[in-house]
């Protein structure tokens, strides 16, 4: 799978994680920090 960094305009899209662009799927994706979930890593779980 080819990935690259998200465009600058997506800065802040992932609240607790890193935004990556999945080139083959034409999708931005939030890779969440440990303890966070959700489309934008907005939910904390214990």
């Amino acid at each position: 799978v080819s990935i690259t960094k998200c465009n600058s305009d997506m800065n802040g899209y992932c609240l607790h994680g890193q935004c990556i662009y999945l080139v083959d799927m034409s999708q931005n994706y939030c890779r969440c920090e440990v303890g966070y979930t959700g489309v934008r890593c907005e939910h904390f779980y214990l």
Partner: antibody, heavy 116, light 106 residues
Amino acid sequence: QDQLVQSGAEVKNPGASVKVSCKASGFNIKDTYIQWVRQAPGQGLEWMGRIDPLRRQTKYREKFEGRVTITADTSTNTAYMELSSLRSEDTAVYYCVRSGREFDFWGQGTLVTVSS
Amino acid sequence: DIQMTQSPSSLSASVGDRVTITCKASQDIHKYIAWYQQKPGQAPRLLIQYTSTLQPGVPSRFSGSGSGTDYTFTISSLQPEDIATYYCLQYDNRRTFGGGTKVEIK
């Protein structure tokens, strides 16, 4: 399926304000950004600004700063674009556009006519 | 704001011709460019995103290329149904559309 349904056509007097709504269904606007784009008759496409409904953060094109306000109501899954101090040059079709995880998905457009 | 200079503003070509449209950005946009087709009275239709990724259902005669500040959109063999106005859009930093290219049949 995902949809962005915009409010109906408006006719406004010069100097007035207009507020266009954009109701989302099939997805949560908190997962997206909502952009606004306009197109005057016979003219090109012009980006106006956008909102991050989750953070309630906005970005506007410089030329619209102070005259446009983009808001979002996450409880009704609806975004709004309000343009004030209308002039004849603001006559255009206004589109809301979803961006975020997937690339752009457009509403059907709302014609705003400014005429005395 | 990033400026997008699109050329030509209009062109006339024969059915079967190769048509090329260019967009030049005022700074590096890291391949974050899309191409739209718009026919009169219709909303824009997304053809290509991320420089060269064709949208599902878009004919393979449409293609895109480029990097840095210089990008190209090509119709390899112009068809009557391709008569429309085409716009580039940079979405690396905020958004800026090119001025559009009106494509007509000779």
